[in-house]
């Protein structure tokens, strides 16, 4: 049976100072050069060792970078974006998406929002009546002390 | 990949007029330039045109004779030159901004970062 992958997708501010070896990663993508099918946008397809990203550590591999200083990454060729990063200065403000996968299991067998296919709250009702018995439990040898 | 692809050049009698057109591709929204090399001299700049074409700048040897333009949606630039002269005679290099949309044009070499192969002009 085949699997559906979801993601979860979230949007970071991360402000980089550049360092001997650039911003620390390389870059794929373009209007002449797409990466992702009908998407023409700019992904990060390497972090350097112990460069500038990897140092800071929030930008990742695969991650998505939606403007640069503020200049938007929407249509643009590739080497033109490459020289964006190249001119953006010493200190340097991305705008990133990160793409989270959050599921990957058969379909028909899932619940909305849980990695593990059971509904979360076939899960949490069990957890918590076992706890409050738990409780009552101990109250009552307590009090028989 | 970036390529500029010179164009238009060739043999012209004195007060003659040639235009230069410069194909450009991998690159756009640059500052654009013409520089021009005659032999046995160092390369100078000619004119420069920025990336929306609403400011250009000229070398005081060619001002009046040269216009600088260009087809934004041809990602092309163009030399329209006039009234040519001996001393014109060089080999013409078109050249783009190393800086995607950089505000300021100027006739710097290290300002331009992609060149094209250039264009025999011959003046007799």
């Known amino acids: 049976m085949n699997g559906r992958v979801d993601y979860l997708v979230t949007e970071e501010e991360i402000n980089l100072t550049r360092g001997p070896s650039g911003l620390g990663f390389n870059i794929v993508g373009g209007t002449d050069q797409q990466y992702v099918s009908n998407d023409s946008g700019i992904y990060v397809s390497r972090i350097k060792e112990n460069g500038a990203a990897a140092l800071d550590g929030r930008l990742q591999e695969g991650d998505k970078i939606l403007s640069v200083n503020g200049q938007d990454l929407k249509n643009l060729l590739h080497q033109d974006a490459v020289d964006l990063f190249r001119n953006a200065g010493y200190a340097v403000s991305l705008r990133v998406q990160h793409r989270l996968q959050v599921q990957n299991g058969p379909i028909g067998h899932r619940g909305e929002g849980d990695p593990s296919g059971i509904p979360i709250f076939m899960v949490l009702v069990p957890v918590f009546a076992l706890t409050m018995v738990a409780a009552w439990a101990f109250m009552r040898y307590r009090q028989q002390l | 990949q970036v390529q500029l692809v010179e164009s238009g050049g060739g043999l012209v009698q004195a007060g003659g007029s040639l235009r230069l057109s410069c194909a450009v591709s991998?690159?756009?929204?640059?500052?654009m330039g013409w520089f021009r090399q005659a032999p046995g001299k160092e390369r100078e700049f000619v004119a420069a045109?920025?990336?929306?074409?609403?400011?250009?700048v000229y070398v005081d040897s060619v001002k009046g004779r040269v216009t600088i333009s260009r087809d934004n949606a041809k990602n092309t630039v163009y030399l329209e030159m006039n009234s040519l002269k001996p001393e014109d005679t060089a080999v013409y290099y078109c050249a783009a901004d190393g800086r995607f949309r950089a505000g300021q044009i100027g006739p710097s070499l290290g300002l331009y970062h992609y060149w094209g192969q250039g264009t025999q002009v011959t003046v007799s």
């Open positions: 991998g690159v756009s929204f640059r500052n």
């Open positions: 045109i920025s990336w929306s074409g609403d400011s250009t």
